[in-house]
Amino acid sequence: KSSNEATNITPKHNMKAFLDELKAENIKKFLYNFTQIPHLAGTEQNFQLAKQIQSQWKEFGLDSVELAHYDVLLSYPNKTHPNYISIINEDGNEIFNTSLFEPPPPGYENVSDIVPPFSAFSPQGMPEGDLVYVNYARTEDFFKLERDMKINCSGKIVIARYGKVFRGNKVKNAQLAGAKGVILYSDPADYFAPGVKSYPDGWNLPGGGVQRGNILNLNGAGDPLTPGYPANEYAYRRGIAEAVGLPSIPVHPIGYYDAQKLLEKMGGSAPPDSSWRGSLKVPYNVGPGFTGNFSTQKVKMHIHSTNEVTRIYNVIGTLRGAVEPDRYVILGGHRDSWVFGGIDPQSGAAVVHEIVRSFGTLKKEGWRPRRTILFASWDAEEFGLLGSTEWAEENSRLLQERGVAYINADSSIEGNYTLRVDCTPLMYSLVHNLTKELKSPDEGFEGKSLYESWTKKSPSPEFSGMPRISKLGSGNDFEVFFQRLGIASGRARYTKNWETNKFSGYPLYHSVYETYELVEKFYDPMFKYHLTVAQVRGGMVFELANSIVLPFDCRDYAVVLRKYADKIYSISMKHPQEMKTYSVSFDSLFSAVKNFTEIASKFSERLQDFDKSNPIVLRMMNDQLMFLERAFIDPLGLPDRPFYRHVIYAPSSHNKYAGESFPGIYDALFDIESKVDPSKAWGEVKRQIYVAAFTVQAAAETLSEVA
């Protein structure tokens, strides 16, 4: 329950006052304001927007609003030497070239500084060779190609369709397969929903539309030149050869009109099965190379982008807590966009702006939160979560001691069907209780709660009558807070119906067509879904910052730990003979989970009964709750991924966007049957079980009575 007793304010200043102050019309106005020109990281336009937000947050009433700048590695196309891909004939003449830019959307033809589609951090190069189609370029796609079809990608240019996994993983997989270049394209099967028109007449991707994006494999490092430390004025920078996560082969994205021209000539092997076919009128042959008549033609890439150390700016706003100013609840989302950012990120930034305005209104009326709330407008998220990571690196000692929670606020919508939440299990009960108090914006659910519509449309696969809440993965600014620092984190947005729309993300993601009009005409004309997301994000922040006892339930962690232990055990049990041979046992892990469950249960009982008027005991209990997430951090990190330190969750090694549970054990078991030294491989499995069991047990003990 919300309580304001400790802040000596009138009862009207409660959660209801905060929520009632949030207005859809304001979010709409802010979105319009943030999307009229591009705000690419490292540009003057984005610096000006940072200063505008700083000024407005001050006007809204925050105690202080500062810019925090860093000099990080960014990547841009060469303005006079454009990137493109050619089909060349045997004489080397270019007989077809891919597009140099997207056709601008209506009304934006005269806008300057629209960055053309490119793969950020691609090295320069002009490789030429035969094409191999590699489906989504997932780990399993390369297994199919190399192991089953005996197709060698070494020295080839591969073409992969966007979707299913983070593009950086696709590039990493292609590199490991020996490819000398990568072409990424958007297939209509993934980015064109049936029965919907393409932009500007609907929300589908036109043939000339292209998805931009970075292709790094940072594994949480932040700025590639200063891993672990802030990219400040006195930073020591690595040489480019030692930079973290940079791709080694040229990469370039294209739309499906251009992809058609490359794929229609493909020869070689037929696709292995229907899952390798998209929706273009092409055979989806794998190659290598073009079919008979065109067998002498090759593909050539022309990539001239440059990596440059560039200044970026975060905006950090503070609303000081009245009772526990040294406890921080953080609401953060990015400001930089690839082009106009109609959805990503400005649908989120507009919501943050309105949340700040509402909190500021309450503060001007004499209210303060119990704990300090920090608001952040991050820069350079699109270039690898750089702004948030550098700021967290600079402030890591404060954050690890004082960080209560981080709520992420990127895109508020990726559809308009139902709510989507990913968060730590500590926040499950907070999210459930909050959504039961909010009205559903959905058609057919008038007068019903958000919890009810969400549960109906997105039911939990395990617990009937409850909604699905997913694991946190990565690909957004919560990464450093959760995966590196162990600060309880969550995110919420409105999403599509995953049952009927099997395309990846939303069709116009990272294209020039992600405009204000896209949102206002097709996704949320009344901005009612934006308002609901503002209520969820803002409501979570309000409760985390204001409730006397932190709204974390450690028993929910116990439940998922058992589920994850069962899951990883069943994966291991696919190799019963080896488990016997190498004496692999999960007993220690299950024992630790059992202990955690019992201790969490007892802690919860004490939490109900303790004297909340005793500030020392209250602070002690709250600290045990705050530090529980921290207790899952292994200071040594995961193997070869030192900045992913959470033992229970990490981004999947095969898809940065997805979360994996017990990632150390999972990765040790992955493809273990193909390892050349089984004894060593199973030894690593045993070591990872040991690390996981120890960590769960150690975390449990932080919840025990202190003396």
């Epitope: 493109y84 077809f96 070239n97 891919t98 597009s99 140099l100 830019f101 997207e102 056709p103 601008p104 209506p106 033809e109 036109p206 043939g207 000339g208 539309g209 739309g255 009109y257 251009d258 058609q260 021209k261």
Partner: nanobody, 123 residues
């Protein structure tokens, strides 16, 4: 109102050059592939050249390849056809036309065309 207006035609001697212009209004040239098409006296329409919206690709009829160059100035919303080494058989009314596919990569059908400008190649 969407329209195309050609200009620059006239009488020219064989072997000489001429540059045709096509001013677009009511729509942004920057989003569309554009064609030049011609019709010789008493003959049917003959496609001449096509350029993609971003000028990354140009396609020409065999009869004009190496002599004609299609180009555009998106800031002026104008399409051009530079005609060199003109021949008597190039005599025709020249029309510019908009490709119907926004962002199209290859010549498709046209949806809008101008009133044409006459080019006469004669000694």
């Amino acid at each position: 109102q969407v329209q195309l207006v050609e200009s620059g035609g006239g009488v020219v001697q064989p072997g000489r050059s001429l540059r045709l212009s096509c001013a677009a209004s009511g729509f942004p040239l920057i989003s569309y592939g554009m064609h030049w098409v011609r019709q010789a006296p008493g003959k049917g329409l003959e496609w001449v050249a096509f350029q993609t919206y971003d000028a990354s690709n140009r396609y020409y009829a065999d009869a004009v390849k190496g002599r004609f160059t299609i180009s555009r100035d998106n800031s002026k919303n104008t399409l051009y056809l530079q005609m060199n080494s003109l021949r008597a058989e190039d005599t025709a009314v020249y029309y510019c036309a908009r490709d119907r596919i926004v962002g199209g990569r290859v010549p498709d059908a046209f949806d809008i065309w101008g009133q044409g400008t006459m080019v006469t190649v004669s000694s």
